[in-house]
């Protein structure tokens, strides 16, 4: 469930602190409820960038697990189509710390509406 997703995000945050990754990532910091699935997609795609750049097995496995969890949770809600949402490339670029904080925020939004 989403609680496990948050714990994976915390784990990624801890793992990244011991590394020096300067990447900036497309970050949705003000998610509209009608675009939360689209925003989640962008966060997950950007997480793969972190995984690639880190080259770290623990980060790779945790990112993969997080995507598996999110996929299964969202698939159980059926196909959700959203329109009028920003493309990932239109989002503001932020550092990893801010990116992960915003990610936790959107997950909490899913928790509050489930």
């Amino acid at each position: 469930n989403w609680v496990n997703v948050i714990s994976d995000l915390k784990k990624i945050e801890d793992l990244i602190q011991s590394m020096h990754i300067d990447a900036t990532l497309y970050t949705e910091s003000d998610v509209h409820p009608s675009c939360k699935v689209t925003a989640m997609k962008c966060f997950l795609l950007e997480l793969q960038v972190i995984s690639h750049e880190s080259g770290d097995t623990d980060i790779h496995d945790t990112v993969e697990n997080l995507i598996i969890l999110a996929n299964n949770i969202l698939s159980s809600n059926g196909n959700i189509t959203e329109s009028g949402c920003k493309e990932c490339e239109e989002l503001e670029e932020k550092n990893i710390k801010e990116f992960l904080q915003s990610f936790v925020h959107i997950v909490q939004m899913f928790i509050n509406t489930s």
Epitope: V37, T57, H60, D61, E64, N65, A70, N71, N72
Partner: antibody, heavy 122, light 112 residues
Framework: EVRLMASGGGLVQPGGSLRLSCAAS????????MSWVRQAPGKGLEWVAT????????YYPDSVKGRFTISRDNSKNTLYLQMNSLRAEDTAVYYC???????????????WGQGTLVTVSS | DVVMTQSPLSLPVTLGQPASISCRSS???????????LEWYQQRPGQSPRLLIY???NRFSGVPDRFSGSGSGTDFTLKISRVEAEDVGVYYC?????????FGQGTKLEIK
């Protein structure tokens, strides 16, 4: 050439246990997630378990969850499947398979071992 | 769980002729990141399965170009442009977009 050698199969009574092993060679074992897939006699394929590269994350279908445990020893390049509370319907050839990572371009079982037969019968 | 349904279950083909196998999923297998994790595996008699196609249409290394994959959403197809004797066996579609990962029942290809 990637090599996967499954072993440990045999005849076991219902309710019994068995541990399968899969020895990997000719690739960097710790760089790949690994899986077990089974095939009952004359039947189709069924996914049984997957384990992440580092071994922290495991995935199972409901049919084996709580009875089977997948694990790995990266220092020995070996994958395991501990099977407890075995049932007649667990009778199958068990294949180990290397799993390509989603993050490196798509998920798939790109290489398979030769399989080991597990027979559960009294 | 996602149910994968293949048709036909038996496919007699004349050597040199084309063959087509259909695979339908009970729900869309497009994942949250927009990827579709649909593979095709071949199992020759007495052998272990072998990867042919991954992510719907990508041929695995060493797979002859007479094999091709297509489809989207819930409907997928494996095509063999000209069947050869070595193509005899059972073909399985497989989805790993969502846990539990699931195979189709298999399609047995035989020579007429």
């Amino acid at each position: 050439e990637v090599r996967l050698m499954a072993s440990g199969g045999g005849l076991v009574q219902p309710g019994g246990s068995l541990r399968l092993s899969c020895a990997a060679s000719e690739f960097t074992f710790s760089n790949y997630a690994m899986s077990w897939v089974r095939q009952a006699p004359g039947k189709g394929l069924e996914w049984v378990a997957t384990i992440s590269r580092g071994g922290d994350y495991t995935y199972y279908p409901d049919s084996v969850k709580g009875r089977f445990t997948i694990s790995r020893d990266n220092s020995k390049n070996t994958l395991y499947l501990q099977m407890n509370s075995l049932r007649a319907e667990d009778t199958a050839v068990y294949y180990c398979a290397r799993r390509v990572s989603m993050i490196t371009g798509g998920w798939a079982f790109d290489y398979w071992g030769q399989g080991t037969l597990v027979t559960v019968s009294s | 769980d996602v149910v994968m349904t293949q048709s036909p279950l038996s496919l007699p083909v004349t050597l040199g002729q084309p063959a087509s196998i259909s695979c339908r999923s009970s729900q869309s297998i497009v994942d949250i990141t927009g990827n579709t994790y649909l593979e095709w595996y071949q199992q020759r008699p007495g052998q272990s399965p072998r990867l042919l196609i991954y992510k719907v249409f990508n041929r695995f290394s060493g797979v002859p170009d007479r094999f091709s994959g297509s489809g989207s959403g819930t409907d997928f197809t494996l095509k063999i442009s000209r069947v050869e004797a070595e193509d005899v066996g059972v073909y399985y579609c497989f989805q790993d977009s969502f846990v539990p990962y699931t195979f189709g029942q298999g399609t047995k290809l035989e020579i007429k």
